[in-house]
């Protein structure tokens, strides 16, 4: 067992049929001695008295709020919540499995530039009864600061039958270096309770390895004189490190014609501007890269040729 | 050229050969022999390999004031990668893969430090860890942590080189 | 199984230009470098450059004097190789090879003619 | 450029013989060395890369050895089907250059 916050502690359990549980020994938190009573959640059925309760905790049924009282009066709380460890592998029943990049992966995270901001989100179908705290810090056994907002929600969606739900956090490292290479990974955690259930999840990654630029600004079109060829021209995002000439982007221009069959023609350059062929019903699209690490490409900036 | 003495480098040699070595990075990565690495802790065996921290003066700022500080860092880096490359973690067992552009990393390694240091001219150089593990999968897990390392130092001196080439080359 | 397939022979007259293509299949195209090698007739291997799908990026062998351009296209899994400017010494069985270093897999070969 | 110099540039044997080609580099280049086959009207056949790592489904008379500038292929055992062209390529850094080629005919 041990203490979450003030008052709210997470018992460790084994979960298998006929486990033995934990035992748990909760003490009230006051200088009073005798006519002491225990009560669980709303029920009014006295547990023990004593200024300590000794409980066998097996199953969901032996969490809650424990509450201590003399003479009518409430004297403190202690919550109790359960952590599963079926087969020696910590349950993950909150959180929906995002299966990308690989199996397993229940946090998601990218920054859109160097500058130590990123944000990660995760998905459930648990709708009510569900809090979420978030710690992350620079490297595990020094670490250094990173501070986290709150966890919002962020998205709903309907799948097949399903309502799922996206929450996302935002968090900013205290002393960023963006022109160094990092040589320690930022770990971010996630405290996940629903009802009586604590899970927790955690996630390691250099910040070079989630950078997904935005996409590229004010993409336009420029046709040339008695030629079918266009010149192409875009700008860096805004949200993009700078200077530009030492964070520099690479760009993907794509031609595609209206159907997904048709054949695509793609150019790769490091200019702003690129002078491609514009067929008919066709559009153009524009992404970017960090022009020095294979980190992701951003999504696609289109306008239509005609 | 970066000589000690603390004259220009050819900043716009430098940047093609470190964008290039960029490329080479990332396409040698998947060829040196078949393993999945995501679950493999990262600290342990990398911590030994030269990092471009904070104090090195090889952001913007630090370029601007005075060059040589980063310059030498990276050179430090260039030579202990190019002997990591030479070292029996990617010439022993097992063997690179056929289509492994190694070979034209270790060169390109050792054609920007070239750049950066011509014959006769000496910087400090960090020493070389005894990396030597014995069994083959540990070769090959170490072959994964260098490479991925070296993408990320490789992609801030190219980040240096091409900001030198913009805003210092006279 | 991997396998590069190339176009058919080619005859040209010099100062034209001759693009081959090379099809991958059987293996991730953007993982790998490409490599252009030709063989005159009765004559060495030769280098002509390479390039790296996932980026583009290509390198020439600079007896080439900007003659050759090499491109793909990741859609298809094709890689191309352009020279223009031709001349009789450019006939040549012209090879595509996959990687950056030795070459376990070589296309069939594109015969390039030039003559008036 | 790296230089390449293959020897000799063509020999004739007996099946069962022992055939040893050698190729120098014009400076180092490790290990980074393939040996090739090749028959006429076919695109060349990789023996051998990293000077000694056997290609996959290569017969085990061939063998490679060196590093640094000298390199050496063997055929433990000639056999009928070995009568070909083979080249020695240097992987280390651009361009990549091939021998002029050793032509092994038969006695």
């Known amino acids: 067992i041990w203490e979450l916050k003030k008052d709210v502690y997470v018992v460790e359990l084994d979960w298998y049929p006929d486990a033995p549980g934990e035992m748990v020994v909760l003490t009230c938190d006051t200088p009073e001695e005798d006519g002491i009573t225990w009560t669980l959640d709303q029920s009014s059925e006295v547990l023990g008295s004593g200024k300590t309760l000794t409980i066998q905790v097996k199953e969901f049924g032996d969490a809650g709020q424990y509450t201590c009282h003399k003479g009518g009066e409430v004297l403190s709380h202690s919550l109790l919540l359960l952590h599963k460890k079926e087969d020696g592998i910590w349950s993950t029943d909150i959180l929906k499995d995002q299966k990308e990049p690989k199996n397993k992966t229940f946090l998601r995270c990218e920054a859109k530039n160097y500058s130590g901001r990123f944000t990660c989100w995760w998905l459930t179908t648990i709708s009510t009864d569900l809090t979420f705290s978030v710690k992350s810090s620079r490297g595990s056994s020094d670490p250094q600061g990173v501070t986290c907002g709150a966890a919002t929600l962020s998205a709903e969606r309907v799948r097949g039958d399903n309502k799922e739900y996206e929450y996302s956090v935002e968090c900013q490292e205290d002393s960023a270096c963006p022109a160094a290479e990092e040589s320690l990974p930022i770990e971010v955690m996630v405290d996940a309770v629903h009802k009586l259930k604590y899970e927790n999840y955690t996630s390691s990654f250099f910040i070079r390895d989630i950078i997904k630029p935005d996409p590229p600004k004010n993409l336009q079109l420029k046709p040339l004189k008695n030629s079918r060829q266009v010149e192409v021209s875009w700008e860096y995002p805004d949200t993009w490190s700078t200077p530009h000439s030492y964070f520099s982007l690479t760009f993907c221009v794509q031609v595609q014609g209206k159907s997904k069959r048709e054949k695509k023609d793609r150019v790769f350059t490091d200019k702003t501007s690129a002078t491609v062929i514009c067929r008919k019903n066709a559009s153009i699209s524009v992404r970017a890269q960090d022009r020095y690490y294979s980190s992701s490409w951003s999504e696609w900036a289109s306008v239509p040729c005609s | 050229r970066a000589v000690p003495g603390g004259s220009s480098p050819a900043w716009t040699q430098c940047q093609q050969l470190s964008q290039k070595l960029c490329t080479l990075a990332w396409s040698a990565h998947p060829l040196v022999g078949h393993m999945d690495l995501r679950e493999e802790g990262d600290e342990e065996t990398t911590n030994d390999v030269p990092h471009i921290q904070c104090g090195d003066g090889c952001d913007p700022q630090g370029l601007r004031d005075n060059s040589q500080f980063c310059l030498q860092r990276i050179h430090q880096g260039l030579i202990f990668y190019e002997k990591l490359l030479g070292s029996d973690i990617f010439t022993g067992e097992p063997s690179l893969l056929p289509d492994s552009p190694v070979g034209q990393l270790h060169a390109s390694l050792l054609g920007l430090s070239q750049l950066l240091q011509p014959e006769g001219h000496h910087w400090e150089t960090q020493q070389i860890p005894s990396l030597s593990p014995s069994q083959p999968w540990q070769r090959l897990l170490l072959r994964f942590k260098i490479l991925r390392s070296l993408q990320a130092f490789v992609a801030v001196a190219a980040r240096v080189f091409a900001h030198g080439a913009a805003t210092l080359s006279p | 199984q991997v396998q590069l397939v190339q176009s058919g022979a080619e005859v040209k007259k010099p100062g034209a230009s001759v693009k081959v293509s090379c099809k991958a299949s059987g293996y991730i195209f953007i993982t790998y470098w490409m490599t252009w090698v030709r063989q005159a007739p009765g004559q060495g291997l030769e280098w002509m450059g390479q390039?790296?799908?996932?980026?583009?990026?290509?390198d020439y062998n600079e007896m080439f004097e900007g003659r050759v351009t090499m491109t793909t296209d990741t859609s298809t899994s094709t890689a191309y190789m352009e020279l223009r400017s031709l001349r009789s010494d450019d006939t040549a069985v012209y090879y595509c090879?996959?990687?950056?270093?030795?070459?376990?897999?070589w296309g069939q070969g594109t015969l390039v003619t030039v003559s008036s | 450029d790296i230089q390449m110099t293959q020897s000799p540039s063509s020999l004739s044997a007996s099946v069962g013989d022992r055939v040893t080609i050698t190729c120098r580099t014009s400076?180092?280049?490790?290990?980074?060395l393939a040996w090739y086959q090749q028959k006429p009207g076919k695109a060349p056949k990789l023996l051998i890369y990293n000077a000694k790592t056997l290609a996959e489904g290569v017969p085990s008379r061939f063998s490679g050895s060196g590093s640094g500038t000298d390199f050496t292929l063997t055929i433990s055992s000639l056999q009928p089907e070995d009568f070909a062209t083979y080249y020695c390529?240097?992987?280390?850094?651009?361009?990549?250059?091939f021998g002029q080629g050793t032509k092994v005919e038969i006695k």
């Open positions: 390039i790296f799908p996932a980026s583009g990026s290509a």
């Open positions: 390529q240097h992987h280390y850094g651009i361009p990549f250059t």
């Open positions: 090879a996959r990687g950056g270093g030795g070459f376990a897999y």
């Open positions: 400076e180092n280049i490790y290990s980074y």
